[in-house]
């Protein structure tokens, strides 16, 4: 019950994150005009991954898109490919984790493979979320640049004043919402990676062909240890030996002429 | 690449009217927020007006609100500044700048420039 509970949360958890990845990359608000020195202003700019926007303080706003793909800061592309990657990878995530799902039956599906899936599905949220916040964070460090640049580049006016050469730019609202989204979806991906563990079965026993001989004498059963690797002991008290021509898991075995020592 | 070349500019009487132009080549103009700048001699360069990529948002210096008009003709590549009842104070070079990225106020935030246009305003 804990395990299918950890999973659905996990889903649900990275689900969201994933919209939030999507929101992010679309919305038009990574940098946003700094008004500290300009609070009254007639025009605010703000700027996302596709487009740049001016604002006039009516409330109409005009966007375009940017029209060059080549002409783009190197940087406003390394975030764009990091964001894309992180939506793709949740997207795929997403996929795998619904019939991961232990609450939905699909056929005669093994736990061990639900297992796998739910693993994989966690991996990629994971490295969804990674990319989300890297993505985010590499924006918001080129932001952080920028704006002490544009403060160190200040001169002193004619009338003393300080002003700046270029209007500077700060965090938006995408920023954070891409933030909060990367790690929802990281998290989600550990609670996933966490309800694997549940859903693995926790020893596997293979079948093994039983010898026995003609009267009620012992058979040696191979089957009664468990694979030769040293994992796991005896513990459900299981009879070695045997006289009876059963495999381990109790299905009848019919004898052949190859079972007679 | 754009290249700005900007004409119009001349000696003119206080109270007059002039109107300038910035016409754009290498690419087109529709693509660029476009804005006027004047430098005074011995003072900086400041911002005039700017208008966005259709023209349909304007920003104003408030020494200029009211008096001066920017506006712009894509299909011509043109951009305008329409200049009334000018007084000694506008006497400058008149430049005109283009930027895809936003409409900024600062000499900074444009990254082409026109070499200018002199404006020189008799009382």
């Known amino acids: 019950m804990a395990v299918t509970a950890c999973q659905g949360l996990g889903f649900v958890v990275s689900l969201i994150g994933i919209a939030g990845i999507i929101a992010a990359t679309c919305m038009d608000q990574w940098s946003t005009q700094d008004l500290y020195n300009n609070p009254v202003t007639a025009v605010f700019n703000y700027q996302g991954l596709w487009r740049s926007c001016v604002r006039e303080s009516s409330g109409f706003t005009e966007c375009r898109g940017y029209f060059t793909l080549l002409g783009l800061p190197a940087m406003l592309q390394a975030v764009r490919a990091l964001m894309i990657v992180g939506i793709v990878l949740g997207a795929i995530g997403l996929l795998v984790s619904i019939f991961a799902l232990k609450c939905i039956r699909i056929g005669s599906m093994e736990d061990s493979a639900k297992a796998n899936m739910t693993l994989t599905s966690g991996i990629m949220f994971i490295v969804s979320g990674l990319c989300a916040i890297a993505g985010v964070s590499v924006f918001a460090n080129m932001l952080v640049t920028n704006f002490w640049m544009s403060t160190a580049n200040m001169y002193t006016g004619m009338g003393g004043m300080v002003q700046t050469v270029q209007t500077r730019y700060t965090f938006g609202a995408a920023l954070f919402v891409g933030w909060v989204a990367g790690g929802l979806t990281l998290i989600g991906g550990v609670m996933m990676c966490i309800a694997c563990r549940g859903l693995a079965p926790e020893e596997t026993n293979y079948k093994a062909v039983s010898y026995h001989a003609s009267g009620h004498s012992v058979a040696y059963k191979p089957g009664g240890f468990k694979a030769s690797t040293g994992f796991g002991s005896n513990t459900k008290n299981k009879k070695i030996y045997d006289g009876g021509a059963r495999t381990e898991d109790e299905v009848q075995s019919y004898p052949s002429k190859h079972d007679y020592v | 690449q754009v290249q700005l070349v900007e004409s119009g500019g001349g000696l003119v009487q206080a109270g007059d009217s002039v109107r300038l132009s910035c016409a754009a080549s290498g690419q087109t103009l529709s693509n660029y927020n476009v804005a006027w700048f004047r430098q005074a001699p011995g003072k900086e360069r400041e911002f005039v007006a700017g208008?966005?990529?259709?023209?349909?948002?304007?920003n104003y210096s408030d020494s200029v609100r009211g008096r001066f008009t920017i506006s712009r003709d894509n299909a011509k590549n043109t951009v305008y500044l329409q200049m009334n009842s000018l007084g000694p104070g506008d006497t400058a070079v008149y430049h005109c700048?283009?930027?895809?990225?936003?409409?900024?106020?600062?000499?900074?935030?444009?990254?082409?420039w026109g070499q200018g246009t002199q404006v020189t305003v008799s009382s």
């Open positions: 208008a966005t990529w259709s023209g349909r948002i304007t």
């Open positions: 700048a283009a930027n895809s990225f936003q409409l900024g106020d600062k000499p900074g935030d444009y990254h082409y």
